[in-house]
Amino acid sequence: HNTTVFQGVEGQSLQVSCPYDSMKHWGRRKAWCRQLGEKGPCQRVVSTHNLWLLSFLRRRNGSTAITDDTLGGTLTITLRNLQPHDAGFYQCQSLHGSEADTLRKVLVEVLADPLDHRDAGDLWVPGESESFEDAHVEHSISRSLLEGEIPFPPTS
């Protein structure tokens, strides 16, 4: 799998989409996990509804939400109030028994907000109590890592 880069602005919402073959993954729940190191496990962040029929319902874990269009074949993850610590490598997964197939490898990059919210005066910033439905979702910038680019740069 190539890694797709999604860039979002700190404090705003980032939407990550993972297309998949809806026939092949028929009846299978999906999940969003965070990769812990290059060869480490992928730690589950949030998964779709326990009943596959209800996968279209948005499920949330903290500031992350997931919803699945099972007929269209698109899994959508929304990271709300994006923070620097959200940057990193993730996977969209399809769950099959005790196994998990990788649908897409994702690198989330968090860009500094060009507006300094502390000096923004009356600028409205979504509060923690705001629902995902009300959150403003920015169009994400995404690209695939070029051949030869290192997803996990060696640490010094």
């Epitope: 026939m23 028929w26 009846g27 596959w52 029929l53």
Partner: antibody
């Protein structure tokens, strides 16, 4: 249009392995569909055995999972069923079928082949 | 496993009669249900998919309805060639079939 044809031994000994092949013609096994096996014991209803996708991903009936293996051979445009440790209860007509799920159901079936488990 | 309960198990009707078969799922399956016709010694034939869609080449006297757990299959005017066993089948999870309904002519 797509046609399916089952083939394999009609008689298998108890505790042996039942092996059947389904040849796909008039289309490609790489088409967007699941390729299924369904069986029907004499005078009884239909039982789904399992299915395979062209990339060799499989789903099996939980009650048969420990004994079933379904494989695909894209070069020959066919898929196969192996059922191990058979008993008389596995005597049935075995059908292969194409399953397009929401997009059209099990819309193409083979004519079926009778397999008898007996010594 | 999702259980499919079909009723009646058999019925006898006259040519031209309206015939109705019901199928009940043990849990919500939305409209993910198919109906098949099987004549003696033949493979099953798809009649209705997604609860209410008529498969290609199937006469319009066959119809299906329902959603959730309760489904109905109807032959609006029974014909001699409709003598067969009819099965419902869900495909939300591992596919399961109803027990079948044998339709005979009076």
């Amino acid at each position: 249009q797509v046609q399916l044809q089952e083939s394999g031994p009609g008689l298998v000994k108890p505790s042996g392995t039942l092996s059947l092949t389904c040849a796909v013609s008039g289309g490609s096994i790489s088409d967007s569909a699941w390729w299924s096996w369904v069986r029907q014991p004499p005078g009884k209803g239909l039982e789904w055995i399992g299915e395979i996708y062209h990339d060799a991903d499989t789903n099996y009936n939980p009650s048969l999972k420990s004994r079933v293996t379904i494989s695909v051979d894209k070069s020959k445009n066919q898929f196969s069923l192996k059922l191990s440790s058979v008993t008389a209860a596995d005597t049935a007509v075995y059908y292969c079928a194409r399953d397009t799920k929401y997009w059209g159901g099990m819309d193409v079936w083979g004519q079926g082949t009778t397999v008898t488990v007996s010594s | 496993d999702i259980q499919m309960t079909q009723s009646p198990s058999s019925l006898s009707a006259s040519v031209g009669d309206r015939v109705t078969i019901t199928c009940q799922a043990s849990q919500d399956i939305s409209n993910y249900l198919n109906w098949y016709q099987q004549k003696p010694g033949k493979a099953p034939k798809l009649l209705i998919y997604d609860a209410s869609n008529l498969a290609t080449g199937v006469p319009s006297r066959f119809s299906g309805s329902g959603s959730g757990t309760d489904f109905t299959f109807t032959i609006s005017s029974l014909q001699p060639e409709d003598i067969a066993t009819y099965y419902c089948q869900q495909y939300v999870e591992a596919p399961t079939f109803g027990g079948g309904t044998k339709v005979e002519i009076k």
